[in-house]
């Protein structure tokens, strides 16, 4: 590895109203020549490591979280690994970790607050 992948998320919690959609922002800086085939992206619940959503082998592997999550596929190649969580519920409140692996890896946690 040449150095950790820098993963950036907002410092402040994302606040969402019950029933609305929330975007958990996560970004990384792709190196020149980066291709989506190299990308392993995993969103997980921070506390339990339960899989929420993943992208690997060049394709979106889909939601593992009640089919309420989606990536922004057209923006992934530019380093936007954000996750859309639809129809937010009270039980969704907590910390989500964005794990990005290319040749090396990095991760960061973002908090969701439900109002």
């Amino acid at each position: 590895p040449t150095g950790a992948v820098e993963v950036q998320v907002p410092e402040d919690p994302v606040v969402a109203l019950v029933g609305t959609d929330a975007t958990l922002r996560c970004s990384f800086s792709p190196e020149p020549g980066f291709s989506l085939a190299q990308l392993n992206l995993i969103w997980q619940l921070t506390d339990t490591k339960q899989l929420v959503h993943s992208f690997t082998e060049g394709r979106d592997q889909g939601s593992a979280y009640a089919n309420r999550t989606a990536l922004f596929p057209d923006l992934l190649a530019q380093g936007n690994a954000s996750l859309r969580l639809q129809r937010v519920r009270v039980a969704d409140e907590g910390s989500f970790t964005c794990f990005v692996s290319i040749r090396d890896f990095g991760s960061a946690a973002v908090s969701l607050q439900v109002a």
Partner: antibody, heavy 116, light 108 residues
Framework: QVQLQESGPGLVKPSGTLSLTCAVS?????????WNWVRQSPGKGLEWIGE???????NYSPSLKSRVTISIDKSKNQFSLKLNSVTAADTAVYYC?????????WGQGTLVTVSS | EIVLTQSPGTLSLSPGERATLSCRTS???????LAWYQQKPGQAPRLLIY???SRATGIPDRFSGSGSGTDFTLSISRLEPEDFAVYYC?????????FGQGTKVEIK
């Protein structure tokens, strides 16, 4: 390239506190990664102990949670492990490692023996 | 916690032979959440495979990983002298992260 190096006493008395430090070189400990402790008892397998994020957030193994504290010192580019009320069962090689999911790289490990 | 069971405990093979190591998980996990490590005596573990099938940086292509659900496999197509070691699988789909008990690949 990130490298890790464990240091600390190789012998701890029963009921005492095991204290180890992991120095990170070749990169900043403030990067977006979790920093872990894993141990391996003599002739046995690997056991994850816990981890810390640069913000200070921690996660611990449920079986050790009541006895473990992991801290981070960003100014010294290092993180530390404290395990209290140790017994002979805590005798192991202790490794530090980088990673949130899988671990890479690892330190070379340091043997800690619990004995009077 | 998820328990990982590796088999066989020991595999006795000759250089040039193919090695097939098994890792079973007590609960089904997504393949993206499994890794393999190699450990030689007196050394720290070394990451070989992550995401069940992706080789880590610098790992030769004779190492390959596969599997899904509860059954995962690490294959070494042609054993080189430096491949004789202990191999561990590890899951990261549930906390705490857990390891298998290891498979020792020894020279026959």
């Amino acid at each position: 390239q990130v490298q890790l190096q464990e240091s600390g006493p190789g012998l701890v008395k029963p009921s005492g506190t095991l204290s180890l430090t992991c120095a990170v070189s070749g990169g900043s400990i403030s990067t977006s990664n979790w920093w872990n402790w894993v141990r391996q008892s003599p002739g046995k397998g690997l056991e994850w102990i816990g981890e810390i994020y640069p913000t200070g957030n921690t996660n611990y193994s449920p079986s050790l949670k009541s006895r473990v504290t992991i801290s981070i010192d960003k100014s010294k580019n290092q993180f530390s492990l404290k395990l209290n009320s140790v017994t002979a069962a805590d005798t192991a090689v202790y490794y530090c490692a980088r990673g949130w999911n899988y671990f890479d790289p690892w330190g070379q490990g340091t043997l800690v023996t619990v004995s009077s | 916690e998820i328990v990982l069971t590796q088999s066989p405990g020991t595999l006795s093979l000759s250089p040039g032979e193919r090695a097939t190591l098994s890792c079973r998980t007590s609960q089904s996990i997504n393949g993206i959440l499994l890794a393999w490590y190699q450990q030689k005596p007196g050394q720290a573990p070394r990451l070989l495979i992550y995401g069940a099938s992706s080789r880590a940086t610098g790992i030769p292509d004779r190492f390959s990983g596969s599997g899904s659900g509860t059954d995962f496999t690490l294959s070494i197509s042609r054993l080189e002298p430096e491949d004789f070691a202990v191999y561990y699988c590890q899951q990261y789909g549930s906390s705490p992260r857990t390891f298998g008990q290891g498979t020792k690949v020894e020279i026959k």
